[in-house]
């Protein structure tokens, strides 16, 4: 055919434009050319060409008269996607082909599973709330928006905000909770995520705090305690930070902690908690419980010897604890705990109130007061301190036989041994867990020879009983262990005299040092039942005023007691023990003194030595008769110095046959001491004394000489 | 008219290897998934895997990993599958299928039986 | 893997009767299940597709529904044509269920 002038080549006036349209859809792809002849389309997908209607009437694309590409409905599944790509349409005649732009169907798609539905918040008032939602994937990328109980969020108020997939609630309220859900939507339509559920509770506040409280024992205290919260808050109590100890307290409906009876162990910090799922609140309140004050242990009247140690115990109890203080009765002077000692004092009183005074003088006889003060109330209690001679010192009571432990039945019957003896003869009394026992308690009686009786035991019974052993030359006491079951033995095994090894023989002293005492002894007479220990115990007037257990389970009959002091004299007695018990004690041996410390390490000046001793100034008492053969000599030192060991008590007959004589000497070797007793003087003679302080062989001055006669007979009262 | 037509019946012995083919006609190779499924003898389908004609990806479940290939030639418009060291319990009718744009096996192939012998 | 259990494995009726046979997915999968259709010696045939929808030139009297893990194909009066073996599969994973034999009773 030959080519006509009016004809020519196709050319495309109507581009395709790209398209997104949802799966299942109708859309169309336009493409409209000019040309003569008029030319013909086809229409090529991603470089294919596309079958239409034209090649398979079946088919869902259909080329339009106009040249464009109709879809009935666009075919899109999860991996088959035949009608998503890239289209142009070609307009072709004899003169040429036309080209189109290219243009891309998209499918539209919106999965029906939310990459992330949001899940159900619990928060407090006042907090944010977050509730997180990815969409489902689809194309194009969907958008969200929230509802509220199916009505959809307005985001214009403040406290709401909604990026990114998030809807932030800034400070919630009540009114948030309820049921939220996301909505993913695009041109394919919306899809509901599942709903979560927002709860707003409210932490714990208190309408009520507990307050602290001031009370009397035994007087009733409540501590109130009112909360509100959502949910309801459980409320708690706790003692200083522990839970409550049982039985005590009673915690009533609207959560007030009352105690019946204070004691001073419910002293404390109390603290009510208020907890709910999102808080915990706490609110504190301290008791305290005001207790008068009352004696633990009395100070009792006592007989000491001049120059040796009395201490008066004075023990108190009291919230708070009470200051304890002494005065002699007639004195203006107070005595108080951990006060300085003054310089020429001799009296102290111990933490714990104990009043001790060292060195008796007979001055020092009186009453002795001892007052216990606090915010509720006061005590006293007087004792009397009588001054004997020098030769009535008498060691503390001896307990013969003593309590053992046992453990017995309830219901059953406990006899708590307690044989003493002494000169004087001792008081026995009893104490449990420290405190005087029987009191009140008609099943508890303490029998002619000090035995303890306790009759119709009951579990409560059981503790520490200690037998006291009290005389005014001091006190011995010993413990036992009382255990109440429901299985032990009805009654107390009540062991025979004969059940019990021997006493030992009169200890010997083998050995002395500065620190210890080597003693020897025999077992019990032949006969007796075997040892198979023994126990060694000790007493000095100036260690304490009772026997003390120096040494346990000793195999041996020869044994070194150390960890004495220097410079001391002390009496020693040996029990012997088998499994039944323990056996009298032996005879007490003689009085044995520990060697002195030694002169301290060499190196010293020597003159300032000699410079600061000579500038010691010893002011001698008027001596005193105590006997026709003993003297009391007493002085005091006008500054102490650094170096001085001892004094030296210089004395001379100067009357009778051996009329100045030469000087007899006793050393007073410790640098506190200020008195001495010379002893073996001769009756109805004059003697001169003096005393003069020393440093290894370095010699102060001597005092002022004095001169006393010692009596024919003794002194008359 | 939309058809799969696939290769005939096929014996092989234990151990050898065995390759079908499924050739398309009537619609575009491309744009559709192309996906094997076999039945041994008195039993169930048993899907073996897909292939993406358009650019050749494949997946195929545990059981058949390593010792199943699928392969396509787009200029013939022809699906294959390759199975190989093949066993008795082998034997089947392996079918070929297209999934359609709703995720459907809409048009499938007449079948080619394998019968593993020795 | 998306596991899927056919009941019954077969069921004996007559012509007329209202037929229902159940597929359960071991998780949720959405709507993403089809039915086929077996006769011996024949390709399977697509019936329903996306749990719910009838492929083009399916007689009416087959429906399907059900949505999640639960499925249901029904077929409201049987004729004799519609005894074969009938197969349900899940689209995510592509595993097909152990089919039910529908007999003439």
């Known amino acids: 055919s030959r080519l006509r002038q009016e004809d020519f080549p196709p050319r495309i006036v109507e581009h395709p434009s790209d398209v997104i349209v949802s799966k299942g859809e109708p859309t169309t792809l336009n493409c409209k050319a000019e040309g003569r002849p008029t030319p013909t389309i086809e229409w090529y997908k991603d470089g294919e060409r596309v079958e239409t209607d034209k090649d398979d009437p079946r088919s869902h694309r259909m080329l339009l008269p106009s040249g464009s590409l109709f879809f009935l409905r666009i075919v899109h599944g999860r991996r088959s996607k035949p009608d998503e790509g890239s289209y142009v349409c070609v307009a072709r005649n004899y003169l040429g082909e036309a080209v189109s732009r290219n243009a891309s169907l998209e499918v539209a798609l919106l999965r029906d599973d939310f990459r992330q539905n949001p899940t159900d918040v619990v928060v407090a008032a006042g907090e944010p709330a977050i509730l997180e939602c990815q969409p489902p994937r689809g194309h194009p990328e969907p958008t969200i928006y929230w509802k509220k109980d199916k009505v959809r969020i307005d985001d214009k108020e403040e406290r709401i905000s909604i990026r990114g997939g998030k809807l932030m609630i800034s400070n919630t309220r009540k009114s948030d909770a309820g049921m939220y859900t996301c909505v993913g939507t695009n041109m394919v339509g919306e899809r509901d995520s599942d709903p979560a559920e927002l709860t707003v509770f409210e932490r714990p506040t208190f309408l009520r705090r507990p307050i602290n409280q001031v009370v009397l024992e035994e007087e009733a205290v409540e501590f109130r305690c009112q909360v509100q919260g959502d949910p309801q808050p459980t409320v708690r109590w706790k003692k200083d930070d522990a839970d409550l100890p049982r039985g005590r307290y009673d915690i009533k409906d609207d959560y007030t902690l009352r105690i019946k009876k204070t004691m001073s162990t419910d002293e404390g910090t109390y603290m009510c908690i208020a907890e709910n799922r999102v808080g915990k609140m706490e609110a504190s309140a301290t008791l305290t419980v005001r207790a008068p004050p009352q004696f633990v242990v009395r100070p009792r009247d006592q007989i000491v010897a001049q120059g040796r140690t009395v201490t008066f115990p004075c023990e108190t109890k009291g919230n708070p604890q009470p200051a304890v203080f002494w005065q002699k009765e007639g004195s203006q002077n107070l005595l108080f705990p951990n006060q300085p000692q003054q310089p020429n004092s001799r009296c102290s009183v111990s933490p714990t109130g104990d009043l001790t005074i060292t060195n008796i003088q007979r001055s020092d006889a009186g009453y002795y007061i001892c007052q216990a003060l606090t915010v509720a109330g006061s005590i006293l209690a007087k004792a009397q301190l009588e001054v004997t001679d020098v030769l009535t010192d008498r060691p503390p009571p001896i307990i013969l036989q003593g309590p053992a432990n046992q453990t017995l039945a309830v219901d059953g019957t406990a006899l708590l041994k307690c044989k003493a003896t002494g000169d004087p003869l001792p008081v026995i009394s009893w104490l449990k867990e420290g405190f005087t026992f029987p009191g009140r308690d008609p099943r508890a009686t303490i029998q002619e020879q000090g035995t303890l009786q306790i009759k119709n035991l009951r579990i409560s019974d059981t503790g520490t009983y200690t037998c006291v052993a009290t005389s005014s030359s001091g006190e011995t006491s010993w413990s036992a262990v009382l255990d109440v079951t429901e299985s032990g033995a009805t009654i107390s095994k009540n062991y025979d005299l004969s059940d019990l090894p021997g006493p030992p023989s009169k200890p010997q002293v083998t050995d002395v040092t500065k620190n210890s005492v080597t003693l020897s002894w025999q077992p019990g007479t032949p006969g007796t039942l075997p040892a198979s220990a023994y126990i060694i115990e000790a007493f000095s007037q100036s260690v304490s005023n009772s026997w003390q257990t120096v040494a346990n389970h000793v195999k041996t009959t020869l044994y070194t007691v150390r960890g004495l002091r220097p410079n001391t004299i002390y009496l020693f007695m040996v029990r012997a023990i088998n499994p039944q018990g323990l056996s009298d004690p032996s005879p007490m041996s003689d009085p044995v003194r520990t060697q002195d410390i030694s002169p301290p390490a060499q190196g010293v000046d020597h003159r300032q030595v000699q410079k600061e001793l000579g500038d010691v100034l010893v002011r001698l008492h008027n001596p005193v008769v105590l006997t026709p053969t003993t003297v009391q000599v007493t002085w005091t030192v006008d500054r102490q110095p650094q170096f001085i060991q001892g004094y030296r008590v210089m004395y001379r007959q100067t009357s009778g046959l051996q009329a100045t004589s030469s000087w007899q000497n006793l050393d007073a070797k410790v640098p506190t001491e200020r008195s001495a007793v010379l002893v073996n003087l001769k009756k109805g003679v004059t003697y001169e004394i003096k005393v003069r302080p020393y440093f290894n062989e370095f010699q102060g001055m001597d005092s002022e000489s004095k001169t006393v006669r010692t009596t024919e007979e003794a002194p008359s009262a | 008219e939309v058809q799969l037509v696939q290769s005939g019946a096929e014996v092989k012995k234990p151990g050898a290897s065995v390759k079908v083919s499924c050739k398309a006609s009537?619609?575009?190779?491309?744009?559709?998934?192309m996906h094997w499924v076999r039945q041994a003898p008195g039993q169930g389908l048993e899907w073996m895997g897909w292939i993406n004609p358009k650019n050749g990806d494949t997946e195929f479940p545990q059981k058949f990993q390593g010792r199943v290939t699928m392969t396509r030639d787009t200029s013939i418009s022809t699906a294959y599958m390759e199975l190989s060291r093949l066993r008795s319990d082998d034997t089947a009718v392996y079918y070929c299928?297209?999934?359609?744009?709703?995720?459907?096996?809409?048009?499938w192939g007449q079948g080619t039986m394998v019968t593993v012998s020795s | 893997d998306i596991v899927m259990t056919q009941s019954p494995s077969s069921l004996s009726a007559s012509v007329g009767d209202r037929v229902t046979i159940t597929c359960r997915a071991s998780?949720?999968?959405?709507?993403?299940l089809n039915w086929y259709q077996q006769k011996p010696g024949k390709a399977p045939k697509l019936l329903i597709y996306a749990a719910s929808s009838l492929q083009s030139g399916v007689p009416s009297r087959f429906s399907g529904s059900g949505s999640g893990t639960d499925f249901t194909l029904t077929i409201s009066s049987l004729q004799p044509e519609d005894f074969a073996t009938y197969y349900c599969?899940?689209?995510?994973?592509?595993?097909f269920g152990g089919g039910t034999k529908v007999e003439i009773k």
């Open positions: 009537g619609y575009t190779f491309t744009g559709y998934y």
């Open positions: 299928a297209r999934e359609s744009g709703d995720d459907a096996f809409d048009i």
């Open positions: 998780q949720s999968i959405s709507s993403y």
């Open positions: 599969q899940q689209s995510v994973g592509l595993f």
